[in-house]
């Protein structure tokens, strides 16, 4: 007799989730010698332990602590890149600028990037049919709590000048409800972080507005300043050119610095 299964509004666990986490862990520890000591089987066991057999609307940050402990990693000062609503460009940037790191360049972020997962109360099964949706079902679901947990930790450990890439094409360039706005901003440590530098990425080729004057950026500046962290903002008018210049800084068209405008 098939057992009754809770139907959630979100898509189910990503196909071959356990194998993907394990394979990603092996690959990551291969190319990051500082994480070579990590036992990927233990990482998977800790990941699994955070959500298996638990009601998927009652997951806590505490559930992920064993995993967080295993994945402890530090980023050098001035090398943290946060992002909001512009993941692809942020990742393209760190693929070129290899000494800067987004959360998804760290082990735990890399393991979970673009994946969905959840279990069921009192069974050892993974639910491949459906998982809770943040809006329609609950916010304390395995995926949302994971990202909140690791984002908090990522922000807490940042130091020096922290950079954030923001999407200038959105109606809210800075969104207080995003992970950046609700978690990371509030967990930067003023005693370790001297400044937050926002890079506002323009969408249109002919867009020459100073988006650093946007009301939501002013709101971000206010929040950051109140936390005794200095704030800077730059317009990135041509993201394609910006990436090209990161790849080839010696290019004559890059030396003039025309691809962004600086605002304090």
């Amino acid at each position: 007799v098939p057992r009754w299964r809770q139907q959630w509004s979100g898509s189910g666990t990503t196909s071959r989730f356990p194998e993907t986490v394990l394979a990603r862990c092996v690959k990551y520890t291969e190319v990051h010698p500082e994480m070579r000591h990590v036992d990927c089987q233990s990482v998977w066991d800790a990941f699994k332990g955070a959500f298996i057999s638990k009601y998927p609307c009652n997951i806590t940050e505490e559930d992920y602590q064993p995993l967080v402990k295993l994945g402890t990693q530090t980023v050098p000062c001035n090398k943290t890149l946060l992002w909001s609503r512009i993941k692809d460009l942020a990742h393209q940037f760190t693929q070129v600028q290899r000494d800067m790191f987004t959360l998804e360049d760290m082990l735990l972020g890399y393991l979970a990037d673009d994946l969905t997962w959840c279990g069921e109360f009192n069974t050892f099964e993974i639910n491949y049919q459906s998982c809770p949706d943040w809006r329609k079902d609950c916010s304390n679901n395995p995926v949302s709590v994971f990202w909140k947990t690791v984002s908090r930790r990522f922000a807490e450990t940042a130091c020096g000048v922290v950079h954030v890439m923001l999407n200038g094409s959105r109606s809210k360039i800075f969104d207080k409800n995003s992970t950046f706005g609700s978690v990371e901003v509030h967990n930067l440590q003023p005693e370790k972080v001297q400044a937050l530098e926002a890079w506002v990425i323009h969408g249109g080729r002919e867009d020459s507005r100073d988006l650093c004057q946007d009301p939501t950026i002013k709101e971000l500046e206010s929040i950051i300043s109140k936390r005794n962290i200095r704030f800077f903002c730059k317009n990135i008018y041509r993201p394609d050119k910006f990436l090209q210049c990161v790849k080839n800084p010696e290019d004559s068209s890059c030396l003039s610095g025309i691809h962004h405008h600086h605002h304090h």
């Epitope: 194998e19 993907t20 394990l22 394979a23 092996v26 291969e30 990051h32």
Partner: antibody, heavy 121, light 107 residues
């Protein structure tokens, strides 16, 4: 018992490409790390790159970047190594090998029998 | 990348004698070192991993030692089937690198 069986010897012209296959039998192919290592006549071993079939997204040694393409087909449990713009110095035996399944250290416990690629005009 | 240097290039030993092969890393590789044996026309065969652990089916006459930058493979009493080329490989820092090999030949 896991085995890696490679395709046969190839003779190629300079400037052309070669594609060597490596078929795995036994075990869970998707989670192996399949690696390619080459050995020029009378020379030592040289690591070229590796792939985890489930993920795709191979890693390459700097020396071969841009010239080598490593792929894997999970449906046939076969990994491939394609080397382009061949020159005489690429004449070598090409081996596929794997790490201990699936999350052991990065030494090679199982090897294919090797494929001799001769580049000659 | 880490450079692995093996010495000597060739070692001439009589059957029954002891052979000592050396492998030096250009920087510390901890104990993340493997040894392989290769006979003519064959693929390499794993002998030792973790600097000192024998792989499955490898006779007790093969032993490995060392850590950091200096490693040794010892064959306590050479048998006729042991005459071959031996390679060390570090798997501490990506990309993985091999030594250039030591040929053990009959004296």
């Amino acid at each position: 018992q896991v085995q890696l069986v490679q395709s046969g010897a190839e003779v190629k012209k300079p400037g052309s490409s070669v594609k060597v296959s490596c078929k795995a039998s036994g075990g869970v192919f998707s989670l192996y790390t399949i690696t390619w290592v080459r050995q020029a006549p009378g020379q030592g071993l040289e690591w070229m790159g590796s792939i985890i079939p489930l993920l795709g997204d191979p890693e390459y040694a700097q020396k071969f970047q841009g010239r080598v393409t490593i792929t894997a087909d999970e449906s046939t449990s076969t990994a491939y190594m394609e080397l382009s713009s061949l020159r005489s110095e690429d004449t070598a035996v090409y081996y596929c090998a794997r790490y201990p399944y699936p999350y052991g250290s990065k030494y090679f416990d199982i090897w294919g029998q090797g494929t001799l690629v001769t580049v000659s005009s | 990348e880490i450079v692995m240097t093996q010495s000597p290039a060739t070692l001439s030993v009589s059957p029954g004698e002891r052979a000592t092969l050396s492998c030096r890393a250009s920087q510390s590789v901890s104990s993340n070192l493997a040894w392989y044996q290769q006979k003519p026309g064959q693929a390499p065969r794993l002998l030792i991993y973790g600097a000192s652990t024998r792989a499955t089916g490898i006779p007790a006459r093969f032993s490995g030692s060392g850590s950091g930058t200096e490693f040794t493979l010892t064959i306590s009493s050479l048998q006729s089937e042991d005459f071959a080329v031996y390679y060390c490989q570090q798997y501490n820092n990506w990309p993985w690198t091999f030594g250039q090999g030591t040929k053990v030949e009959i004296k």
